[in-house]
């Protein structure tokens, strides 16, 4: 049904005809996410009519139908202005049972109405800066947070929980004031950590190897994203003991997430959000990643369970396959691994054994090949200085921040970027701060050491002198040609 | 039975092993010597690389040598405070205390009259008052926007010591001095068993013999280019844009017969300035044939390719390209902060409509 016909039906106002027109429009456009320009004015007219009814109050019998139409039109950028008014937003918030001024609806709310309103709000907040501002002013976050806190006591359908969390994500992603409010005033970290535990269905002590079902995965990812939004600019501060305990507890849940798989093909996505959040934990709380008890089949190294570190390495390996969005794909996991390695000797030694095992193949340049080491060394000359830096820093820490060792594994040419940035081009500290870390040389390396070009990091035969057979005079002449060039360069 | 060795035989085997080991160690020592040539135009960021070089002198300087640097220390100190005061005018920064304007005028008078190698109490007092001023400090904090000697803060913070009549520069003071380099500055540094010799090559022609030992057996060339030079307008006496000039020289050096097997470490510096400029100033100013977008990624990659494609020996000669900027920090945490915004943006992008 065309928007004009629906608008005409609305203007005549015969209830059954209106409802039928709306239903027909909804059926036809349930999957429409782009709209042609030809009917733009008709859609705007329809949106205005819907808004006027919405603001006066929708009849209980057909609320869902009306809200569905509003939802469809809220996908259309040209209709956003009509919906993004204080009254419309307030009406939608009331139907979603998150309006702050209203007393909570005494009778149990109609979940279908609630759901449709939440979807409308999500669309509006995602697309309209005005709606974002109005939603922040209306303090929708307060009642949303309140409802998230009720999930333990009352059963809400998965979809309602999901859209609550999605709306929380959108508000915290788009509004710094809402971020602050949820973090501080509403104790968002505690609230959402609790919601995460509930969603994962675990007590922090146990760590069963699970496959998280599809719906729980969806909700968990929304929670992780909200937590990311509210912690990334707050956690840089020093945390007191009470907060540290909370973050450690959150860390145990994140550890569980890293060890679990998600239903469908969503494991990598799920782990991506988990790792992003791990990067926001206060550094002193990362020790929980190494606190898993040893059990049958776990990876043990120096008496420590390395399952989580190994899982993060496997995640890094997977992420290094892709070429787009490289920075946000690899920087968080590399940051987390770097900090773990910096603070924990067993983690560092385990990671070094996995990523920089004693050198055997000294005939190939460090950046050539498919091993994790080769891929990371390749990143050390990456165009994006953030990517380059985080990869180099990881390898540098695995070398115990010893410049000679770093050069040995990566070659001075590849290492030069980090060394220059760190003021270490000519050594600086002779050894890193990790003097207890040994580095073992293989027989192959010892044999070849004299022939390794430290710049390329591989064995190279001494090249013949290109000036062989020239007289001193000729050499001087060639040298002066170069000097003249340099003279030009430095002017 | 036939496998047992006599004591003499054992000793002979040990001697033989030792000789082998010594020979191998001598070979290693020679092989583990790395010769670097540092090249780059005046504004290329080369000085930043030089700054990183912690010059390790075998026996340091004698007291007599140190005394001779007194005039340089004073000159560096006075030039630094003058550079800051001049920059305040350009950057439109006011003195915190209006009375300092008189001191600034006095500074220029006293500095002009100062005898080389001496600093009067009056001049020292003027410099000290100026250096303490909040406006001067604000200007100092923006020193990347103008030319300021590296060791400015080092000397100015230590003015009480330096201005003493019986002052003799310390080793550290000497190392901090800056004199316009001519010819070649040679720096030695060691990483465990790797012995590096770096030659910072200025353009002044000095004694020819000196040059030859510089160019023979070079392991790697560090070549610095300022990315942000791409849009600089030609001065009247220039034939080509500075970026093209750099490329031309890179070509000549990269493919020069002296450097057939020499790796090149290419520092494309000032990427932060380039990132800002590219939004307003298209790359076609420098490369008219460029058809890509004016995003940092695409434009920087294009410049990288322009340089790397000049290498005629791609199979045997390595070019290690590093994009750098003065704001590179020491901590991965900062990298993660830079990624945070991108993560949120992408999470939003992945949110569909319902």
């Amino acid at each position: 049904m065309e928007p004009r016909a629906v608008a005409d039906a609305l203007e005549t106002g015969e209830e059954d005809a209106v409802t039928e027109a709306l239903r027909s429009f909804n059926r036809e456009h349930s999957q429409s996410f782009t709209f042609d320009d030809a009917q733009q004015e008709d859609r705007k007219r329809l949106a205005k009519l819907l808004v006027s009814v919405l603001e006066q109050g929708l009849s209980p019998k057909h609320r869902v139908t009306w809200l569905q139409t509003i939802r469809i039109l809220s996908r259309d950028r040209s209709c956003l202005d009509s919906f993004a008014s204080r009254q419309s937003l307030h009406a939608l918030a009331c139907y979603a049972d998150i309006a702050i001024s209203e007393e909570p609806i005494p009778q149990p709310p109609d979940m279908d109405v609630l759901l449709e309103s939440l979807k409308c709000l999500c669309n509006l907040v995602l697309s309209s800066p005005t709606a974002q501002m109005l939603a922040a002013e209306a303090r929708l976050v307060v009642r949303l947070a309140e409802r998230v806190g009720l999930y333990r006591k009352r059963s809400y359908p998965h979809e309602v929980q999901f859209f609550d969390l999605r709306l929380l994500f959108l508000l915290t992603a788009l509004r710094t004031d809402v971020r602050q409010q949820l973090f501080q005033e509403l104790h968002g970290v505690r609230l959402l950590t609790d919601a995460l535990e509930l969603t994962l269905g675990v007590a922090p002590k146990e760590n069963p190897l699970v496959i998280l079902p599809a719906q729980e995965t969806e909700r968990a990812m929304e929670i992780l994203k909200v937590l990311f939004n509210i912690t990334y600019d707050s956690v840089k501060r020093e945390v007191d003991e009470e907060d540290a305990a909370l973050y450690r507890y959150l860390g145990t849940l994140l550890r569980h997430c890293v060890m679990a798989d998600a239903a469908g093909d969503r494991t990598e996505e799920f782990h991506g959000h988990t790792v992003n959040l791990l990067g926001n934990l206060p550094l002193k709380c990362l020790d929980v990643l190494l606190a898993l008890e040893l059990h049958e089949g776990s990876l043990e190294f120096m008496g420590v369970n390395m399952d989580v570190i190994n899982a993060l390495l496997a995640f890094l390996e997977k992420r290094l396959h892709q070429t787009h969005r490289l920075k946000e794909c690899v920087a968080p996991v590399l940051s987390v691994l770097t900090e773990c390695a910096r603070m924990h000797r067993p983690a560092r030694k385990f990671l070094k054994a996995q990523v920089l095992p004693p050198l055997r193949d000294v005939r190939t340049r460090p950046e050539v090949g498919d091993l994790l080491r080769n891929k990371l060394v390749r990143l050390m000359t990456h165009l994006d200085t953030d990517v380059k830096r985080v990869a180099a820093e990881f390898l540098f820490v695995l070398c115990s921040e010893s410049v000679p060792r770093f050069i040995k594994y990566t070659g001075y040419g590849n290492a030069a970027g980090l060394l220059a940035a760190r003021g270490l081009m000519a050594g600086g500290r002779p050894e890193g701060q990790y003097s207890e870390d040994e580095d073992t040389d293989t027989e192959e390396y010892r044999e070849a050491k004299a022939s390794i070009n430290p710049v390329t990091g591989r064995v190279e035969e001494k090249p013949p002198n290109p000036m062989e057979g020239m007289t001193e005079e000729q050499k001087e002449h060639e040298a002066m040609k170069l000097v003249n060039m340099f003279d030009k360069l430095s002017r | 039975m036939g496998c047992t060795l006599s004591a003499e035989d054992k000793a002979a085997v040990e001697r033989s092993k030792m000789i082998d080991r010594n020979l191998r160690e001598d070979g290693e020592k020679a092989a583990r010597e790395v010769k670097l040539l540092l090249l780059g135009a005046g504004e290329s960021g080369k000085s930043t690389i030089v700054k990183q070089m912690k010059i390790i002198h075998e026996a340091g300087y004698s007291e007599e040598e140190c005394k001779q640097y007194k005039a340089v220390v004073y000159s560096n100190t006075i030039q630094s405070i003058i550079a800051i005061i001049r920059a305040m005018g350009r950057l439109k920064i006011d003195f915190g205390d209006a009375a300092r304007a008189d001191d600034a005028r006095q500074l220029f008078v006293l500095a002009g009259a100062a005898e080389e190698g001496f600093m009067t109490a009056e001049l020292a007092g003027v410099i000290k008052r100026l250096w303490k001023d909040s406006g001067v400090q604000a200007c100092f904090n923006r020193s990347r926007e103008y030319q300021l000697n590296d060791s400015a803060a080092y000397y100015l913070n230590d003015l009480d010591r330096i201005a003493q009549p019986n002052y003799i520069p310390t080793q550290q003071d000497v190392l901090r001095t800056r004199v316009k380099t001519t010819g070649i500055v040679e720096t030695h540094f060691t990483f465990k068993d790797l012995h590096f010799k770096m030659f910072d090559v200025g353009g002044q022609r000095s004694e020819r013999k000196k040059w030859i030992h510089c160019f023979e057996g070079v392991t790697a060339i560090i070549f610095c280019v300022a990315l942000s030079d791409y849009d600089l307008v030609l001065a009247e006496d220039e034939e080509m844009n500075r970026m093209h000039e750099s490329m031309k020289l890179f070509d000549s050096i990269c493919n020069n017969k002296w450097f057939t097997d020499t790796s090149i470490i290419l520092f494309l510096n000032k990427k932060d300035l380039f990132e800002e400029k590219i939004k307003k100033s298209p790359l076609t100013i420098c490369y008219p044939e460029y058809a890509g977008s004016n995003t940092y990624e695409e434009a920087a990659a294009y410049i990288q390719c322009q340089f790397e494609d000049l290498n005629k020996r791609k199979d045997t000669k390595e070019i290690y390209t590093h994009f750098t900027c003065a704001t590179d920090t020491k901590n991965v945490q900062f990298v993660f902060d830079a990624v945070t915004d991108v993560i949120i943006k992408n999470n939003l992008k992945d949110c569909g409509l319902f």
């Epitope: 069963p208 494991t267 049958e296 190994n310 496997a314 890094l316 997977k318 996995q354 498919d370 | -």
Partner: nanobody, 116 residues
Framework: QVQLVESGGDLVQAGGSLRLSCAAS????????MGWYRQTPGNQRELVAE???????NYADSVKGRFTISRDNAKNTVYLQMNRLKPEDTAVYYC??????????WGQGTQVTVSS
């Protein structure tokens, strides 16, 4: 990226024993389930035994009590210890790994022949 290499297949007399092994290489992986399947000419592949990451195992009725599956997570390797072999165990044995992020991978197969 993920390569599986099987070994241990051989010709053995009835009542004898064999140990098959299968290792994944090509990177750092998390392997969820590891399993052994077998196939005789003209028949479908059938599950012999599988083991989860936590070490819980499951066997086909025909091999229970005779075969033991085990895994070494550090080496990304699965083993099948086959005791009291019977002629009807003759088949090509394939290992199957379910690798996190990458999905399912099969080995190239190793021939086990039990003569009577």
């Amino acid at each position: 990226q993920v390569q599986l290499v099987e070994s241990g297949g051989d010709l053995v007399q009835a009542g004898g024993s064999l140990r098959l092994s299968c290792a994944a290489s090509g990177g750092i992986f998390i392997i969820n389930n590891m399993g052994w399947y077998r196939q005789t000419p003209g028949n479908q592949r059938e599950l012999v035994a599988e083991i989860t990451r936590a070490g819980n195992s499951n066997y086909a009725d025909s091999v229970k009590g005779r075969f033991t599956i085990s895994r070494d997570n550090a080496k990304n390797t699965v083993y099948l210890q086959m005791n009291r072999l019977k002629p009807e165990d003759t088949a090509v044995y394939y290992c199957n790994f379910n690798v996190r992020y990458y999905g399912e991978y099969w080995g190239q197969g190793t021939q086990v022949t039990v003569s009577s």
